[in-house]
């Protein structure tokens, strides 16, 4: 018996087609993805093949103006239109709190939304009961397939799930649910979830009874053969894991932003064992036409967005590199721009002894969600900035000891190379890392811009001195593992909305050209 699994993950509000780097579509003939194009391909496969499931592994929420304006209603509407069979909850589904998940999505979705390792407690338990499930058994042709969901247990550090949801260890929570499916004589089981590729592989290895793992969160691109676009494969598709009980378990992910449709064919024997698995992500490029009915619906929903944010704020004459590949690994000019805007927004010349009360900015690279292409006449709109900074956060002022900042910069690179969001972009700081040293001892130079000076210059950080720093509220609250900031900050003052800070700066500057200028170095 053959099953076709179509899958998406980390779509992040890319309902419309995008450019190749998943920013706003500029040249339509070269654009990719979007739900109208996705629907065309899904329907084509549904017509051609008998047993098809369309699954999403989470993080539909957050990423463009669509989410800023519609707050999840757009996700429910278009996923219903595409007839998704199931979705796992991702961490970003909690960005607007639990209410922002329940009302627009959980109550409106016509497909099951899954997570076995999220347990509700307190008054929320009865409110959310039945709106998401640990698993669902789906009839497919003459067979049934069990889908069991999971969500990153790091979600409380990454989003806003509140205090009444407990995120359990994925493997511990999944095993009894898979065992339950086995008692129902469900012998074909897919783990669908949002914890990243490393956890996906662990689930494949450790959870007895899981036949296939469909993942998300780490934006992992897998491909067998010559990849069709810019993404470099992290391994073959599917990635085969040998389970502890000796089975070959295919693990898949489909990059992100709706650029690809994951396509996996699985052959099962009569006992539900995987005999073979093969496939590849399908690049949703312009050779696949956009479905006219979905496109018309998109255009109808688009009207509200156009009114919202299409005015030009200013211009860039350089590419604003906000890609994960840059901002999570090295200094990126988008990070420099944002930090410069953050400092600029806090210029307060209140004392002749100080040119300003604050000179430093830190910004988690994972908070930069999109680049901006200068080839669209250089125009920058609120909409462009909403894709870069989609989380609706604030840029806050804190006071920290030098020792806390040192810990923060060690945390920035403690697991460098895994494309994790804690890598810090900076302003008013020069940092040098030596990655050959062990984690916790990799910062070899940390100089900070003086404030009590007429000519600003960089001086070594003093461990016992108290510094003012501008940073996202996400970091002030200990997000991305920066617990030391939350625990050790001496003062915390709420600031202005992130997009507003950057848009005001761009409007003030009129033309911008941020450079990569040696703020972050590796020895």
């Amino acid at each position: 018996w053959e099953l076709t699994i179509l899958h998406t993950n980390d779509v992040h509000s890319r309902l419309e087609q995008t450019s190749e780097d998943s920013s706003k579509c500029v040249n339509a003939s070269r654009c990719m993805g979007g739900v109208a194009r996705l629907f065309t391909k899904v329907q084509q496969i549904r017509r051609a093949e008998p047993n098809v499931l369309l699954l999403d592994a989470g993080d539909q929420y957050q990423g463009t103006i669509w989410f800023t304006v519609y707050k999840g209603a757009e996700v429910a509407h278009f996923m219903n239109a595409l007839r998704y069979d199931a979705m796992a909850l991702g961490n970003h589904e909690f960005d607007n709190g639990v209410e922002g998940l329940i009302e627009p999505l959980l109550k409106e979705a016509k497909f099951p939304i899954l997570s076995a390792n999220i347990k509700a407690k307190g008054p929320l338990a009865s409110q959310i009961s039945g709106l998401y499930l640990p698993y669902k058994v789906l009839p497919v042709g003459d067979e049934v397939v069990g889908i069991v969901g999971y969500t990153s247990k790091e979600t409380p550090f990454l989003s806003n799930p509140g205090t009444n949801l407990v995120f359990e260890d994925e493997i511990t929570a999944l095993q009894p649910e898979v065992d339950k499916l086995k008692t129902l004589n469900v012998n074909k089981i897919i783990a669908l979830g949002h914890s990243g590729f490393e956890m996906d592989k662990l689930i494949a290895q450790k959870v007895r009874g899981v036949d296939v793992v469909v993942g998300g969160h780490s934006n992992t691109f897998l491909y067998t053969g010559n990849p069709p676009s810019k993404e470099v494969p992290a391994g073959k598709y599917p990635f085969i894991v040998t389970s502890d009980d000796g089975r070959k378990v295919p693990v898949v992910q489909a990059y992100a932003f709706g650029k690809y449709l994951g396509y996996l064919k699985i052959e099962f024997d009569e006992r539900g064992n995987v005999i073979s698995s093969h496939g590849n992500p399908i690049l949703l490029n312009s050779s696949i036409p956009e479905d006219p009915s979905i496109k018309a619906d998109i255009n109808k929903w688009r009207i509200k967005l156009d009114n919202y944010s299409t005015q030009e704020l200013g211009k860039t004459i350089v590419y604003l590199d906000g890609s994960s590949q840059s901002c999570r690994f090295r200094e990126c000019n988008m990070g420099n721009l944002i930090c410069d805007a953050m400092i600029n927004n806090n210029l307060r010349h209140t004392d002749e002894m100080f040119w300003n009360h604050v000179s430093m900015c830190i910004l988690n690279g994972g908070g930069i969600r999109s680049p901006i292409d200068e080839r669209n006449n250089g125009t920058i709109t609120w909409e462009n900035l909403a894709a870069v900074l989609p989380f609706g956060g604030t840029f806050d002022l804190v006071q920290l000891k030098g020792s806390t900042l040192k810990k923060a910069f060690e945390h920035s690179v403690h697991r460098y190379g895994q494309s994790t969001g804690e890598f810090l972009q900076v302003g008013g700081i020069h940092v040098v890392y030596d990655l050959s040293r062990k984690p916790g001892d990799r910062v070899v130079k940390l100089d900070v811009l003086c404030t009590k000076c007429r000519v600003p210059s960089y001086d070594p950080l003093k461990m016992d001195e108290v510094y003012k720093v501008i940073l996202p509220n996400f970091l002030a609250n200990g997000g991305d593992g920066f617990q030391m900031i939350k625990d050790e900050l001496l003062r915390h003052d709420s600031g202005d909305q992130d997009i507003n800070v950057v848009s005001t700066y761009i409007s003030k500057m009129k033309v911008i050209y941020p450079a990569v200028e040696g703020r972050i170095k590796f020895s």
Partner: antibody, heavy 119, light 107 residues
Framework: QVQLVQSGAEVKKPGASVKVSCKAS????????IHWVRQAPGQGLEWMGA????????SYNQKFKGRVTMTVDTSTSTVYMELSSLRSEDTAVYYC????????????WGQGTLVTVSS | DIQMTQSPSSLSASVGDRVTITCKAS??????LAWYQQKPGKAPKLLLY???SLETGVPSRFSGSGSGTDYTLTISSLQPEDFATYYC?????????FGGGTKVEIK
């Protein structure tokens, strides 16, 4: 609205068989399990087994395996439960009930069929 | 098989009383618990599933709680139509099993 209508009462002799029917309407027949639950006079509820009309898959309570047969006729949206080698302790009201494939609580029940086993 | 032990087996109460029925599973059932109400000569009626989820049309005076092996059905203010027998049922492990029932009678 969802309805499960069962066949009428039966009187059987020990050693005989009985076949009870359950006709479903008001929902998509092939997407829910039909379960059989019995209740002896003055006693509690006992689950016997279930059939999934979508693919004919059956799960049994081991206590009844070999004596109970469940079949489905999708053309008439009817499920049948046959219990063989009847004995006096099989005297009970037999209910069919609808349940999700994956979460087997029973949201709709038939009216019940009394089966009396007596010599 | 998972044994479901209900207590008490019967109780007498008056209209307006708060009534609590408990159900103990012989092993963990991961919140896969339903409660039914049955009146003489009638089929059981689903009240709650998943421990706390109220079936459509069931009055809000019925509520459920519990986790692991211990579960409770509470009727916050007993009404004349609530005098009946109540059963719990686990649907974690086949065979699905019911508690022995609790008969709620008029005092």
């Amino acid at each position: 609205q969802v309805q499960l209508v069962q066949s009428g009462a039966e009187v059987k002799k020990p050693g005989a068989s009985v076949k009870v029917s359950c006709k479903a309407s008001g929902y998509t027949f092939t997407t829910y399990n039909i379960h059989w639950v019995r209740q002896a006079p003055g006693q509690g509820l006992e689950w016997m087994g279930a059939i999934f009309p979508g693919n004919g898959h059956i799960s049994y309570n081991q206590k009844f395996k070999g004596r109970v047969t469940m079949t489905v006729d999708t053309s008439t949206s009817t499920v049948y439960m046959e219990l063989s080698s009847l004995r006096s302790e099989d005297t009970a009201v037999y209910y069919c009930a609808r349940g999700d494939y994956d979460e087997s609580y029973f949201d709709y029940w038939g009216q019940g069929t009394l089966v009396t086993v007596s010599s | 098989d998972i044994q479901m032990t209900q207590s008490p087996s019967s109780l007498s109460a008056s209209v307006g009383d708060r009534v609590t029925i408990t159900c103990k599973a012989s092993e963990g059932i991961y919140n896969r618990l339903a409660w039914y109400q049955q009146k003489p000569g009638k089929a059981p009626k689903l009240l709650l599933y998943g421990v706390i989820s109220l079936e459509t049309g069931v009055p809000s005076r019925f509520s459920g709680s519990g986790s692991g092996t211990d579960y409770t059905l509470t009727i916050s203010s007993l009404q004349p139509e609530d005098f009946a027998t109540y059963y719990c049922q686990q649907y974690w492990s086949i065979p699905w099993t019911f508690g022995g029932g609790t008969k709620v009678e008029i005092k």
